[in-house]
């Protein structure tokens, strides 16, 4: 039995949340990935990658950037200029169909509070598009992009999840992924 417990991150307004989500290379390298926020029982898709995924081509939706590295089985998520209202529960998912998705790794509980973050959030943007090629035994990343594409997407899609998030999420009988059934 695998128990998925939420992982807590506390930030000040203006800071940047960055998380890395692993996925099984052989299963999901060519799948679309998404970043979603749980709103009550409704997960809302905030941003999703294109298909097929391309190395080093970020998808940006507002303050959210998704960067998929299918050669590494890694999705990087970045939310800049965090605001108090961003607080909530987030998940990386494999977006295989609007009516079903697979949750990757543990949910992220984001708590954003007011106060000085040390460095204004806007100054962080200067580093958003600077990536170093990783040292890895997996295939090397393709050429670094020169001008990131901004992908305009439709409004967030809502789906219905069967579990209700509380202060802690416990999803049992899970191996690598959790199937989230959706009802229309």
């Amino acid at each position: 039995t695998t128990e998925l417990t939420e992982e807590k991150y506390e930030y000040k307004e203006g800071q940047t949340l960055e998380v890395k989500c692993d996925y099984a290379l052989e299963k999901y390298a060519n799948s679309r990935k998404a970043w979603q926020k749980m709103e009550g029982k409704m997960p809302k898709i905030l941003a999703k990658t294109e298909r097929p995924s391309e190395n080093s081509h970020p998808v940006q939706v507002g303050r959210i950037t998704l960067e998929d590295y299918p050669d590494h089985g890694l999705l990087q998520v970045r939310m800049t200029n965090l605001q108090v209202e961003d607080s909530g529960l987030y998940q990386c998912v494999i977006y295989q169909h609007p009516k079903e998705s697979h949750v990757l790794f543990n949910p992220i509980c984001l708590v954003v509070t007011k106060g000085s973050s040390g460095t204004p959030g806007s100054s962080e943007n200067s580093t958003q598009n600077v990536y170093r090629t990783p040292s890895t035994t997996a295939k090397a990343l393709g050429p670094r992009y020169t001008s990131p594409r901004t992908v305009t997407q439709a409004p967030p899609e809502s789906t219905v999840v069967v579990s209700t998030p509380g202060s802690e999420i416990n999803l049992t009988n899970v191996t690598d992924i959790i199937r989230v059934p959706v009802f229309n």
Epitope: Y11, K20, Y23, R132
Partner: antibody, heavy 119, light 108 residues
Amino acid sequence: EVQLLESGGGMVQPGGSLRLSCAVSGFTFSRYAMSWVRQAPGKGLEWVSEMRGSSGSTYYADSVKGRFTISRDNSKNTLYLQMNSLRVEDTAIYYCAKEFSSNSLFDYWGQGTLVTVSS
Amino acid sequence: EIVMTQSPATLSVSPGERATLSCRASQSVNSNLAWYQQKPGRAPRLLIYGASTRATGIPARFSGSGSGTEFTLTISSLQSEDFAVYYCQQFYNWPPWTFGQGTKVEIK
């Protein structure tokens, strides 16, 4: 309770090999990225290698690239570090560490195993 | 690689006093910074991650702040068990993950 227990350290001559093991319990090993971090006597911490969870991707510090190999056996809940062509400067306590959440920081550490490379 | 520089190398503080430790990154790591405490003969212990989030079980007297390249760990009122070596570590983007050289907090 999360536990990590390293073994396999010892004394070896330069050019020799050692295989470190880290047996873990208390969490779903296959889901988490794991790292090896070392600390030379009286010195600071140095990250050595990482193996991601679901993807199995591996990463190495430049100082060990081509000489060390990280691997894992999810059925045995064990992380390994195969160290070849050892050098005197590889002498250190080697810790295995569980990575927190999906980011490469370390919330649980083993007690460490000492590797001494000396002629 | 990103170089992490800690200051001071040694900090002499009396019990009950406030301790302020600094960590500087050679380039922005946003909020991808952690602080660890290490006592002699022991493995490091995670104190702070995400620059300001306290790890499970860490007392409220430990606080972290900063973003970008400048970070601070503050111990508001030093207890006897807080005398140790403290390391910062960046986990921004891709490996290698790098640590600062450490700050030793000793009894004054």
